[in-house]
């Protein structure tokens, strides 16, 4: 069988072995080494030796397989924007940001550059779950029966109505969407002023 | 600017090993995009290239030398050094090491040491 | 290897006159991987033409390279006092790097 070609070696087709750790150099006709993420090109290749990788400064990543001449300089999370880090820019990632809690991507090139603040559910309805916290406004669905949320918020979650015979009571008046079950002493028959609330 | 300088000895029996440094002055060894060379000149004979060296120890021989040659690399003192084993008559020359020049001249040499004569003898 | 074979050995000229130095390559080596050399008794090599045909720094524009594939030129329009040395090829093409067994330009 052929021996394997080691870079820097001649191609003719413009195309390189193993595309991911090689690339073409178009002005000697040769594939050569990409450098590792981590690191950056420190020497390009000719047609004698190979390309020389070196380290990313502190501060610095590149984070694919590359040919750059440089390392990308970390950002950090913008807090006006509304991010915020979850985990630290390394040599080979950079920085990983997150919309703050309470807020969702507005604005979105590659990564997320702007959050906003998540639209308020009003009374009888929360907002569905998603996959990914952040990833877009509130989409408030009401609640399902036997529930209830009873204030305009983009976080609270609907409730399950009170069992008013968990309490060793009786309902008085059942819950909606928007609002519990009203419960009452057994004993005590409602006063018609007192209707809709709860009687201890 | 950058300079070259070859030091070391000018008489090495035969069998032993020849070991030569080079300080480059001017500039720092770990410049980006430069290799550092060796090449050698027999008495009224043409250049022979020994090989070259990158600040990180990247090497590259010449493979008719490659099991005699060692090139190595002191950043901290902004040197870098030949050593050439097991040397006969036939290893007399004038040493010199020079500078890749790198960019859109690629490997050939844009800097030079004056030179330093090694003579092997008995 | 690449052998490099210069010609002619030695060429006598006067201050004034004009030098043609071949340099052939014994196989292609294309035309951005030969330079030229100058070298003076006692002295390292200076480097002229890189890439076949362009100056290296500081260069004067009497010296000129052409060629590609495996004939190469180096040609000096005037020769002055100075320009009278060896002058050497070399090829960056392939390794080892090579170079050619020199021309020398002497007063006639």
């Known amino acids: 069988s052929q021996p394997q070609a080691v870079p820097p070696y001649a191609s003719e087709n413009q195309t390189c072995r193993d595309q991911e750790k090689e690339y073409y150099e178009p002005q000697h006709r040769i594939c050569c080494s990409r450098c590792p993420p981590g690191t950056y090109v420190s020497a390009k290749c000719s047609r004698i030796r190979d390309t020389v990788c070196a380290t990313c400064a502190e501060n610095s990543y590149n984070e694919h397989w590359n040919y750059l001449t440089i390392c990308q300089l970390c950002r950090p999370c913008d807090p006006v924007m509304g991010l915020e880090e979850i985990a630290p820019c390394t040599s080979k990632r950079k920085t990983q940001c997150r919309c703050q809690p309470g807020m969702f991507c507005a604005a979105w090139a590659l990564e997320c550059t702007h959050c906003e603040l998540l639209s308020d559910c009003p009374p009888g309805t929360e907002a569905e779950l998603k996959d990914e916290v952040g990833k877009g406004n509130n989409h408030c669905v009401p609640c399902k029966a036997g529930h209830f949320q009873n204030t305009s918020s983009p976080s609270a979650r609907c409730q399950p109505h009170t069992r008013c015979e968990n309490q060793g009571l009786v309902e008085a008046a059942p819950g909606t969407a928007q609002s519990d079950t009203t419960c009452k002493n057994p004993l005590e028959p409602l006063p018609p002023e007192m209707s809709g609330t709860m009687l201890m | 600017q950058v300079q070259l300088q070859e030091s070391g000895p000018g008489l090495v029996k035969p069998s032993q090993t020849l070991s030569l440094t080079c300080t480059v002055s001017?500039?720092?060894?770990?410049?980006?995009?430069?290799?550092w060379s060796w090449i050698r000149q027999h008495p009224g004979k043409g250049l022979e290239w020994l090989g070259f060296?990158?600040?990180?120890?990247?090497?590259y021989y010449n493979p008719s030398l490659k099991s005699r040659v060692t090139i190595s690399v002191d950043t901290s003192k902004n040197q870098f050094s030949l050593k050439l084993t097991s040397v006969t008559v036939a290893d007399t020359a004038v040493y010199y090491c020079?500078?890749?020049?790198?960019?859109?001249?690629?490997?050939?040499?844009?800097?030079w040491g004056q030179g330093t004569m090694v003579t092997v003898s008995s | 290897d690449i052998v490099l074979t210069q010609s002619p050995g030695t060429l006598s000229l006067s201050p004034g006159e004009g030098a043609t130095l071949s340099c052939r390559a014994s196989?292609?080596?294309?035309?951005?991987?030969l330079a030229w050399y100058q070298q003076k008794p006692g002295q390292a090599p200076r480097l002229l033409i890189y890439?076949?045909?362009s100056r290296a720094t500081g260069i004067p524009d009497r010296f000129s390279g052409s060629g590609s594939g495996t004939d190469f030129t180096l040609t000096i329009s005037r020769l002055e006092p100075e320009d009278f040395a060896v002058y050497d090829c070399?090829?960056?093409?392939?390794?080892?790097?090579?170079f050619g067994g020199g021309t020398r330009v002497e007063i006639k």
């Open positions: 020079a500078r890749v020049c790198g960019g859109d001249c690629y490997d050939a040499f844009d800097i």
């Open positions: 060296i990158y600040y990180s120890g990247t090497t």
């Open positions: 890439g076949a045909s």
């Open positions: 196989q292609n080596i294309s035309n951005t991987y």
């Open positions: 001017g500039g720092s060894i770990r410049s980006d995009g430069y290799f």
């Open positions: 070399q090829q960056y093409f392939s390794s080892p790097i090579t």
